[in-house]
């Protein structure tokens, strides 16, 4: 009997990231008696839900239950039955749902209502589904990576990492500026974490995720096309795709480029030219107006960049596919590789990457070029500061992203003071 293992005193939590292009379910685990320590929570499972993002279910809300089934059943298997009832489940929807809400609160509510009803059917402690703000998305991403990197731990207050997050519909930049006043109150966050104060800058650029940026670029470029053929430098030579004008103008992101066109469809014909693609993308960033000492683009305040940055989500996935995540690869080298990649004929690309879905494969030239344009011209990284960008997918087995930070906050696992001190009221938490 002496050798019998004691039941481990652990807790679990589930967060669903309802993004614009897909939903992912994350399961986290931590030792119950250490929940106020930094770095003890870790991810034990990621389940990617098959299908698009929840905002695409507007016309088929009855399918949402089935859509979520596989991953919720997976959670049932992974988490011991005895823990089900005390395992919290949170769903956070991001920019795809912000865009749907912008078009219609009713439709966004309807989708979330059905999601809530579906998730309530499971034996877990469902805590609700909501659309998180862009500011929350940025802040929780920053908390996640610094928690996992142990940057809140050290008494000397080693520098925190900045967070760069790229999704399908938005992108976030979050960091602690160096002795710089955050000139725009909308971009300022104050945290007290583990006994230390942090003045954090964050901004979420809605419509500047990689998918919505592509829709914007297409809507901009078709304005000046002489006919229903769009010769596009952001797609490989020989690539062809028909686009419905109605699909192009479905999103609020293309509203400023909307016009009456003499055709219902147009054909993208790839010409694969990185430089021209880059130039076209730059036209999406309005840098002519800045009411502050310094801006990113579109009149949004951005303090001087400071310290190291973790670039995750699509920043990582795209650069990983392009084999450009190594810290040894300079910005000049990345640009050089992108030039070569975009110039490769479509037939050749399809052969080289036979296992990759054509829809995704066709967009890597645009996405890679967009990432470079966003980081360099949008956020003002330079060839020198490029080495401070670390493309990261996971940190010690946990995905970099907003979900862990969100759960840590909602479960009150990030204390304002060092855990040694007396427990404080909930009001002191983030």
């Amino acid at each position: 009997t002496q050798n019998k293992a004691l039941p481990e005193n652990v807790k679990y939590g589930i967060v669903l990231d309802a993004g614009s292009s897909h939903t992912s379910l994350y399961i986290y685990k931590w030792p119950a008696e250490k929940e106020n320590d930094t770095g003890v929570v870790h991810q034990v499972e990621e389940c990617r839900v098959k299908g698009p993002g929840i905002s695409k279910f507007v016309q088929k809300v009855n399918e949402i239950g089935i859509y979520l089934t596989d991953c919720m059943e997976r959670a049932r298997e992974v988490i011991p039955r005895s823990q089900h009832q005390e395992t919290p489940v949170y769903l956070g929807a991001t920019a795809g749902m912000r865009l749907l809400r912008m078009e219609s609160e009713e439709l966004a509510d309807r989708v979330l209502d059905v999601v809530e009803r579906s998730l309530s059917n499971y034996p877990f402690d469902f805590q609700g589904a909501r659309i998180i703000t862009g500011q929350e998305e940025g802040a929780y991403g920053w908390i996640t990576i610094n928690y996992l990197l142990g940057r809140f731990k050290t008494p000397g207050g080693s520098e925190t990492f900045g967070a760069l997050d790229l999704g399908g519909a938005s992108t976030q930049v979050t960091f602690v500026p160096q002795n710089q006043t955050i000139e725009s109150p909308d971009n300022a966050l104050q945290f007290r974490l583990y006994g230390k104060d942090y003045n954090v800058y964050t901004h979420s650029f809605l419509c500047y995720g990689k998918d919505q940026a592509l829709w914007q670029k297409l809507a901009k470029d078709i304005q000046v096309a002489s006919n229903e053929i769009l010769r596009d430098p952001c797609f490989h030579p020989g690539y062809k795709k028909v686009v419905n004008v109605s699909d192009l103008y479905k999103t609020p992101c293309t509203k400023r480029f909307e016009m009456t066109l003499p055709f219902q469809q147009f054909e993208i014909q790839g010409i694969g030219n990185y430089q021209q693609c880059h130039q076209s993308i730059l036209e999406l960033f309005n840098t002519s107006y800045c009411p502050y000492s310094q801006c990113a683009f579109n009149g949004i305040f951005l303090p001087p960049l400071q310290g190291d940055f973790g670039a995750f989500s699509a920043f990582y996935f795209v650069m990983k596919f392009l084999n450009l995540t190594s810290e040894k690869v300079s910005q000049e080298k990345v640009t050089e590789m992108m030039k070569k990649f975009c110039a490769q004929p479509w037939e050749e690309i399809k052969t080289s990457y036979a296992g990759v879905k054509e829809k995704y494969l066709s967009e890597y030239c645009f996405s890679g070029t967009y990432i470079l344009s966003l980081l360099l011209q949008g956020y003002h990284f330079t060839a020198d500061s490029w080495e401070h960008i670390h493309f990261i997918g996971k940190i010690q087995g946990s995905d970099a992203g907003w979900t862990l930070g969100y759960m840590l906050n909602l479960t009150n696992m990030i204390p304002a003071e060092q855990p040694l001190s007396t427990p404080l009221s909930h009001s002191t938490y983030v």
Epitope: V58, M102, S104, E106, C253, R256
Partner: antibody
Framework: EVQLQQSGPELVKPGASVKMSCKAS????????MHWVKQSHGRTLEWIGY????????TFNQKFKGRATLTVNTSSRTAYMELRSLTSEDSAAYYC?????????WGQGTLVTVSA | DIVLTQSPASLAVSLGQRATISCRAS??????????MYWFQQKPGQPPNLLIY???NQGSGVPARFRGSGSGTDFSLNIHPMEADDTAMYFC?????????FGGGTKLEIK
């Protein structure tokens, strides 16, 4: 708490233009559209159009197209409506309202009087 | 354009009784399983105040005595029991398609 604060009353001459403002607070300004509504004689409500603060794109009621211009300044979280070539028919209260399809929050209104 | 015909144009109801206002659309205002029909209350010198959204959902802080119903083209707003504070103008609105339109209004008074 969400608030929409509109500019004060305007007395303008026929043929002139008027530009009114609507300052938003209590929410992310670029996450919601801003609509403009005209109310004449305390009874008839007419939707003028809306602007997407995110990018400045706008959609109008055909009746007001070409005569109304909608703009925003995102740094000051303010939406503007300019109406040109005013006639006595334009004497009315003008409201801004936040929403996609649900006008849950309204400004207090700007009263415009067109008189020689 | 979708035309909304509101009736009656004016209505006097005794305190504690039921007030019913009707709104008929020239075509269906339903889409994707949602009725894009809204009801507003407006008091003199004030902006309209959202009472009901999506035909039957109560707006934030709206008392339970305000009830909306209907779908497709026929909608109604019921107020029961009528209170003195309910004296106001009431408007229906559709946002199914541009241009968004309002009904002509109903003036509700105490009998």
């Amino acid at each position: 708490e969400v608030q929409l604060q509109q500019s004060g009353p305007e007395l303008v001459k026929p043929g002139a233009s008027v530009k009114m403002s609507c300052k938003a607070s209590g929410y992310t300004f670029t996450d919601y559209n801003m609509h403009w509504v005209k109310q004449s004689h305390g009874r008839t409500l007419e939707w003028i159009g809306y602007i997407v603060p995110l990018n400045g794109g706008s959609t109008f009621n055909q009746k007001f197209k070409g005569r109304a211009t909608l703009t925003v300044n995102t740094s000051s979280r303010t939406a503007y409506m300019e109406l040109r070539s005013l006639t006595s028919e334009d004497s009315a209260a003008y409201y801004c309202a936040r929403g996609g399809t649900r006008f849950a929050y309204w400004g207090q209104g700007t009263l415009v009087t067109v008189s020689a | 354009d979708i035309v909304l015909t509101q009736s009656p144009a004016s209505l006097a109801v005794s305190l504690g009784q039921r007030a019913t206002i009707s709104c008929r659309a020239s075509e269906s205002v339903d889409n994707f399983g949602v009725s894009f029909m809204y009801w507003f209350q407006q008091k003199p010198g004030q902006p309209p105040n959202l009472l009901i959204y999506g035909a039957s959902n109560q707006g934030s802080g709206v008392p339970a005595r305000f009830r909306g119903s209907g779908s497709g083209t026929d909608f109604s707003l019921n107020i029961h029991p009528m209170e003195a504070d309910d004296t106001a103008m009431y408007f229906c609105q559709q946002t199914k398609e541009v241009p968004y339109t309002f009904g002509g209004g109903t003036k509700l008074e105490i009998k």
